[in-house]
């Protein structure tokens, strides 16, 4: 058993059928030594009467909040919480398996560019009496700073018969240097309470490996006299580390006609210009992507050819 | 994807062409590492992340752009002195903080090559034959000394009397290129910067 | 006293479906995961599918996949396997089980798939 | 399709020490416990070691488990006659939890 936070502890179960749990000595936080008694949650059944009560926790009807009163009034509260350790691997039930870019993740954490502050988020179908904490570490030995703000529901999508919730949260590394070369990765731990479920989730990774822009800016076309061709330009998204000569990106252009079916042209330059050659009805995307180091390309940016 | 290979102006930045050239050979040599070595520990994930040239050099901190020393964070100053006569630099833009970035990439290049030879040495001990170095990395790394050019002492390349342990060559091999892709990053960010200055 | 009580097995011809149950007492059933796990004559163990304990995630053996179902239903306190399109190769011993470090095992059902 | 190798027989005299060898991965063995299971003819399998090395209430402690990197390993110290079995190995991978995975077994004979 350990705490959580103050008056809140985790019980760690080998959960199988017929197990024999874990024997837990609350003791109730009062000066007085006489006339103590304890209930469960909202039951007015008595469990036991002095200033600590001895319980063997095996199922979630032992868990909850215990509290110890004299005479109708309340001294002191001890929630218990279960994690539940299956054929020692601890559960993750409240999240969902995202899949990507692996099994068994499930969070998932992107960044814009390399300041230190990037963006987790992950799913659950759970609608209510769900909470969530998060806390970042640069490395884990000798952690370096990592603030992250709270977790907020950013997403609501029906999946087939299901609802499905997103949560993410916006961590920043207190002294990050755009430049520096990672060794030590960033730790991502998040601790999930639903009901009285206790469950926890973490990943690790460098920042240079979640790197996403965001798509290039100011996409514009310029049409070339008596030719189909067009020059397509753009700009470096505004949050995109600077300066932009030793942040390089490279992009993509694309050709796409209003068919899915038709043929995509691709280009792939270091510029922020291009020349292609327009079909009526087609749209021109662009993507961007680090220059050097090849982690995910950002998402298009468009414009009709018309 | 290949990274696009860029063809040098006659003006253009020396050095820019062979540093692109450097990252594409230490990735495909990584990427074949990280194939051919599917049953060892050796993804991004698994390794210990190990820079050979920590405390030796400080190539991040020598070659950080103007704008970013500003950045207290990116002060994390190492005393380091260097031999400064560069042939990359054209003459009008020698600078002593350039001058000193060059060099520490130089060095960072130089103990690369020794410790990838020694390691090549012992993989071709290995009766298994699984993995060699790739000789186009090992020529890149060369050609990007020679355009360098700094004048400095051979480094002997070390040699090991005891029977080499090919599991754990082959994981030092992983770690050893994973980190100089890294630095091979740095050196390309560093490149395209003094190019475009 | 946790026990796992099988039937369903039986003789049936090839492209023929078959439902196999696995009645469960003595535990809170609906609190834990059940596997099937099969043995063909003279073969060593197969695992073939796995549900959550609120039925909300399964998982199955490549081998059976898009032909076996696994349900449950929480409220009779029993496990099933939906068995469609059985080939020969699906000959074999069925057990249910209860997943956790210590397991319980059913007695078995014996699935003949033969014309 | 079995990924964690067993032989396919250990034989021993009552009183010898028998080993039975478990070849697995870095993503099953490597990364999760092993189960080991006990089967007699025409019963269903008996579990004999959970948690790699952990022996469940009421199992004999000549039996033991041990892991080491991407192997384990059941012994039987001082073989008894009633020991003739066969024995399986079982772990997860990594990445696909809860899909089980059994060894290739290993059937015990007593000399």
């Known amino acids: 058993i350990w705490e959580l936070k103050k008056d809140v502890y985790v019980v760690e179960l080998d959960w199988y059928p017929d197990a024999p749990g874990e024997m837990v000595v609350l003791t109730c936080d009062t000066p007085e030594e006489d006339g103590i008694t304890w209930t469960l949650d909202q039951s007015s059944e008595v469990l036991g009467s002095g200033k600590t009560l001895t319980i063997q926790v095996k199922e979630f009807g032992d868990a909850g909040q215990y509290t110890c009163h004299k005479g109708g009034e309340v001294l002191s509260h001890s929630l218990l919480l279960l994690h539940k350790k299956e054929d020692g691997i601890w559960s993750t039930d409240i999240l969902k398996d995202q899949k990507e870019p692996k099994n068994k993740t499930f969070l998932r954490c992107e960044a814009k560019n390399y300041s230190g502050r990037f963006t987790c988020w992950w799913l659950t179908t759970i609608s209510t009496d769900l909470t969530f904490s998060v806390k970042s570490s640069r490395g884990s030995s000798d952690p370096q700073g990592v603030t992250c703000g709270a977790a907020t529901l950013s997403a609501e999508r029906v999946r087939g018969d299901n609802k499905e919730y997103e949560y993410s949260v916006e961590c920043q590394e207190d002294s990050a240097c755009p430049a520096a070369e990672e060794s030590l990765p960033i730790e991502v731990m998040v601790d999930a309470v639903h009901k009285l479920k206790y469950e926890n989730y973490t990943s690790s990774f460098f920042i240079r490996d979640i790197i996403k822009p965001d798509p290039p800016k100011n996409l514009q076309l310029k049409p070339l006299k008596n030719s189909r061709q067009v020059e397509v330009s753009w700009e470096y998204p505004d949050t995109w580390s600077t300066p932009h000569s030793y942040f390089s990106l490279t992009f993509c252009v694309q050709v796409q006609g209003k068919s899915k079916r038709e043929k995509k042209d691709r280009v792939f330059t270091d510029k922020t210009s291009a020349t292609v050659i327009c079909r009526k009805n087609a749209s021109i995307s662009v993507r961007a992507q680090d220059r050097y180091y090849s982690s995910s390309w950002s998402e298009w940016a468009s414009v009709p050819c018309s | 994807r290949n990274l696009p290979v860029a063809t040098p102006d006659p003006g253009m930045f020396p050095c820019l062409h062979h540093s692109q050239n450097l990252l594409r050979a230490v990735s495909n040599m990584l990427q074949k590492a990280r194939q051919t070595l599917e049953f060892y520990p050796c993804t991004s994930e698994e390794i210990d992340h190990e820079d050979i040239t920590k405390d030796k050099t400080s190539t991040v901190e020598a070659c950080l752009p103007l704008e970013l020393t500003k950045n207290e964070s990116c002060l994390n100053s190492r005393e380091t002195s260097f031999i400064t006569n560069g042939s990359c630099l054209a003459s009008r833009k020698t600078s002593f903080m350039m001058a000193l970035c060059l060099s520490s990439i130089y060095e960072d290049l130089k103990m690369y090559q020794v410790e990838f030879k020694t390691m090549n040495a012992k993989l071709l001990m290995d009766p298994k034959r699984q993995i060699f170095l790739d000789q186009n990395m090992l020529a890149v790394i060369d050609e990007l000394m020679q355009a360098l050019n700094f004048n400095s002492e051979t480094v002997p390349q070390k040699s090991s009397l005891e029977e080499p342990d090919f599991y754990k060559t082959k994981i030092k091999l992983c770690i050893l290129l994973h980190a100089f892709r890294i630095r091979a990053v740095t050196i390309d960010r560093v490149m395209s910067y003094l190019n475009a200055s | 006293q946790v026990q796992l009580v099988q039937s369903g097995g039986g003789v049936v011809q090839p492209g023929r479906s078959l439902r196999l149950s696995c009645a469960a007492s003595?535990?809170?059933?609906?609190?834990?995961?059940m596997h099937w796990v099969r043995q063909a004559p003279g073969k060593g163990l197969e695992w073939v599918a796995f549900?959550?304990?609120?039925?909300?995630?399964?998982y199955y053996a490549d081998s059976v996949k898009g032909r076996f179902t696994i349900s449950r239903d929480n409220s009779k306190n029993t496990l099933y396997l939906q068995m469609k399109s059985l080939r020969a190769e699906d000959t074999a011993v069925y057990y249910c089980?209860?997943?956790?470090?210590?397991?319980?095992w059913g007695q078995g059902t014996m699935v003949t798939v033969s014309s | 399709s079995y990924v964690l190798t067993q032989p396919p027989s250990v034989s021993g005299t009552p009183g010898q020490r028998v080993t039975i060898s478990c070849s697995g991965g870095?993503?099953?063995?490597?990364?999760?416990?092993v189960k080991w299971y006990q089967q007699l003819p025409g019963t269903a399998p008996k579990l004999l070691i959970y948690?790699?090395?952990q022996r469940p209430s009421g199992v004999p402690d000549r039996f033991s488990g041990s892991k080491s990197g991407t192997s384990a390993s059941l012994a039987i110290t001082g073989v008894q006659a009633e020991d003739e079995a066969d024995y399986y190995c079982?772990?997860?991978?990594?990445?696909?939890?809860?899909?089980?995975?059994f060894g290739t077994g290993t059937k015990v004979t007593v000399l």
């Open positions: 089980k209860t997943h956790g470090s210590h397991d319980n």
């Open positions: 003595g535990f809170t059933f609906s609190s834990y995961g």
């Open positions: 549900i959550r304990y609120d039925g909300s995630n399964k």
């Open positions: 870095r993503s099953n063995i490597g990364s999760n416990t």
């Open positions: 948690g790699n090395d």
């Open positions: 079982q772990s997860y991978d990594r990445g696909t939890h809860p899909l089980t995975m």
